[in-house]
């Protein structure tokens, strides 16, 4: 009874299509696979960024797999062939591992890469990234930003740089069609007459770096002798009401400070008849139903009532 063996996949490699971190892992079928024609051969693929403690594991019938990686670090991957038990009249048979690595040869010392990279997707409409030049780089150093997300044919360069002293220190992006809820890849590289500049790679999802506009049209409405309803409207723009959380800051007679976080565009405040002055501000943030993270908006303009009887039905600034 001869032992069934299977070879590992051939030509296992990591292919960089130039998408700034979105890589293809590709391989060819093992040698002598024709003995298992009636069988659906599978492949177990494991991969990770070098330095990561955990491997991502995929089982696939395909000859390729795609995923995003941090190109600031190297990548390692391994794959073997699996023959399911149905093919071998017994237990699953595995080949030996085929292994491969990939990294971008770093140019320049780490200090030359951009510092304090910060990207904000303003009101889910306008992406702006800014950075500081690397430590100790000369004024002739210029940085260039490239970006890619699934849907673009190739990586694009920034066409509207923010400059300081003739150096690029940021990028205003054009309208980014169908770019949220997917990985957005950025590379900032540089050039200098004097020394090589280290590239930096960044990956994020746009919906997680949204900074909305502040809420507008703040109003007061007396609900009862001891309740006032504070109301406001969602900021103008593409973000739907269901995506907002709000933080309110209320000052009563310059003494009491109330802060609250709410999901709706209203807040009911308990008051006393002695209240002579009431002011509140609101700010907004994209909530957990629409993103994993976000940035609080600026505070709205302050809305105050003072010196009049709060029993009036509606109080507008």
């Amino acid at each position: 009874d001869t032992e069934i063996k299977v070879n590992p996949p051939q030509d296992f490699e990591i292919v960089d299509p130039g998408y700034l971190g979105y890589l293809y892992l590709q391989w060819q079928p093992p040698l002598s696979l024709d003995h298992f024609k009636e069988c659906t051969v599978e492949y177990e693929l494991k991969y990770r960024n070098i330095g990561s403690e955990t491997w991502k594991t995929i089982i696939t019938k395909n000859l390729h797999y795609k995923d995003g990686f941090d190109l600031n670090k190297g990548i390692e991957a391994k794959i073997h062939t699996l023959l399911p038990w149905q093919c071998t009249n017994g237990s699953e048979v595995q080949s030996s591992w085929a292994e491969t690595t990939y990294w971008i040869s770093p140019q320049g010392i780490p200090e030359t890469k951009v510092q304090d990279m910060d990207c904000v997707y303003y009101n889910w409409q306008y992406l702006l990234c800014s950075w500081k030049p690397g430590i100790g780089v000369l004024l002739d150093t210029n940085y260039n930003l490239f970006y890619w997300y699934e849907g673009l044919d190739h990586a694009l360069q920034c066409v509207d740089y923010i400059k300081a002293d003739g150096q690029n220190i940021g990028c205003r992006f054009p309208y980014l069609e169908a770019s949220d809820y997917k990985d957005f890849y950025i590379c900032v590289n540089g050039s200098s007459e004097n020394k090589p500049i280290r590239s930096s790679y960044f990956t994020f999802q746009l919906q997680n770096i949204v900074k909305p506009l502040p809420p507008v049209y703040l109003t007061f409405t007396r609900e009862s002798s001891c309740e006032i309803k504070l109301k406001w409207s969602i900021p103008l723009g593409p973000i739907p009401a269901r995506c907002f959380d709000y933080e309110i800051e209320i000052r009563e007679d310059d003494t009491t400070l109330v802060t609250a976080t709410v999901e709706n565009e209203t807040y009911t405040l308990k008051t006393t008849n002695e209240t002579r002055q009431l002011c509140f501000v609101v700010r907004s943030k994209v909530n957990i139903y629409c993103s994993d993270d976000g940035i609080w908006s600026e505070w709205s303009d302050k809305q105050c009532w003072e010196g009049e009887d709060l029993s009036k039905k509606t109080l507008l600034r």
């Epitope: 490699e13 292919v15 960089d16 060819q28 079928p29 024709d34 390729h64």
Partner: antibody
Framework: EVQLVESGGDLVRPGGSLQLSCAAS????????MSWVRQTPDRRLEWVAT????????YYADSVKGRFTISRDNARNTLYLQMSSLKSEDTAMYYC???????????????WGAGTTVTVSS | DIVMTQSHKFISTSVGDRVSITCKAS??????VAWYQQIPGQSPKLLIY???YRSTGIPDRFTGSGSGTDFSFIISSVQAEDLALYYC?????????FGGGTTLDIK
């Protein structure tokens, strides 16, 4: 339409050099291994060299090893064959061919270009 | 290296006939054999791979069979446009070699 277009063939003296190019279109170039296959004047087909989809794996026929270099530029969808120390027996029609890939098999050639002629003669 | 031998250099046949072209490998290649057709003035075209799998768009009058060392390529009903040179090739392990070719001549 899947297309391979070779160029660079010429008449060259023995010991000379030549670079062939193959422009690919109509498919995702970076997903397929690519090869050069030549057809001698007596119409025999001879596999010359193969490069894997990402360029990490390269295979040569013994008859060209050390003299020919296969390479690819996935950004430009182009395959190259740099030929040096050419001999009269390298005279042939050189075809660029895409490596077919199925779940069970590979290393056959499912798309061929029209070819470019290399003549090595003094 | 694995040598692929096509014993018949020429086969003469008539339209509508069934014709068989054979190819022998010098060692076991499993079913890793492909067949190509080269019409005069054109480049080769893949017909069959893995001994018996038809390439996309190939008419079903073309079939392939065999395993190990002996392989056959059959045209069940020869058409005038089948006048061509036919090659076998093993796609087992490098170097990938071709047979010397069989010319199909239509009477």
């Amino acid at each position: 339409e899947v297309q391979l277009v070779e160029s660079g063939g010429d008449l060259v003296r023995p010991g000379g050099s030549l670079q062939l190019s193959c422009a690919a279109s109509g498919f995702t170039f970076s997903r397929n291994g690519m090869s050069w296959v030549r057809q001698t004047p007596d119409r025999r087909l001879e596999w010359v060299a193969t490069v894997s989809s990402g360029g990490s794996y390269i295979y040569y026929a013994d008859s060209v090893k050390g003299r020919f270099t296969i390479s690819r530029d996935n950004a430009r969808n182009t395959l190259y064959l740099q030929m040096s120390s050419l001999k009269s027996e390298d005279t042939a029609m050189y075809y660029c061919a895409r490596q077919g890939t199925t779940a069970l098999a590979t290393r056959f050639f499912d798309v061929w270009g029209a070819g470019t002629t290399v003549t090595v003669s003094s | 290296d694995i040598v692929m031998t096509q014993s018949h250099k020429f086969i003469s046949t008539s339209v509508g006939d069934r014709v068989s072209i054979t190819c022998k490998a010098s060692q076991d290649v499993g079913t890793a054999v492909a067949w190509y057709q080269q019409i005069p003035g054109q480049s080769p075209k893949l017909l069959i791979y893995s001994a018996s799998y038809r390439s996309t768009g190939i008419p079903d009058r073309f079939t392939g069979s065999g395993s190990g060392t002996d392989f056959s390529f059959i045209i069940s009903s020869v058409q005038a446009e089948d006048l061509a040179l036919y090659y076998c090739q093993h796609h087992y392990s490098a170097p990938w070699t071709f047979g010397g070719g069989t010319t199909l001549d239509i009477k």
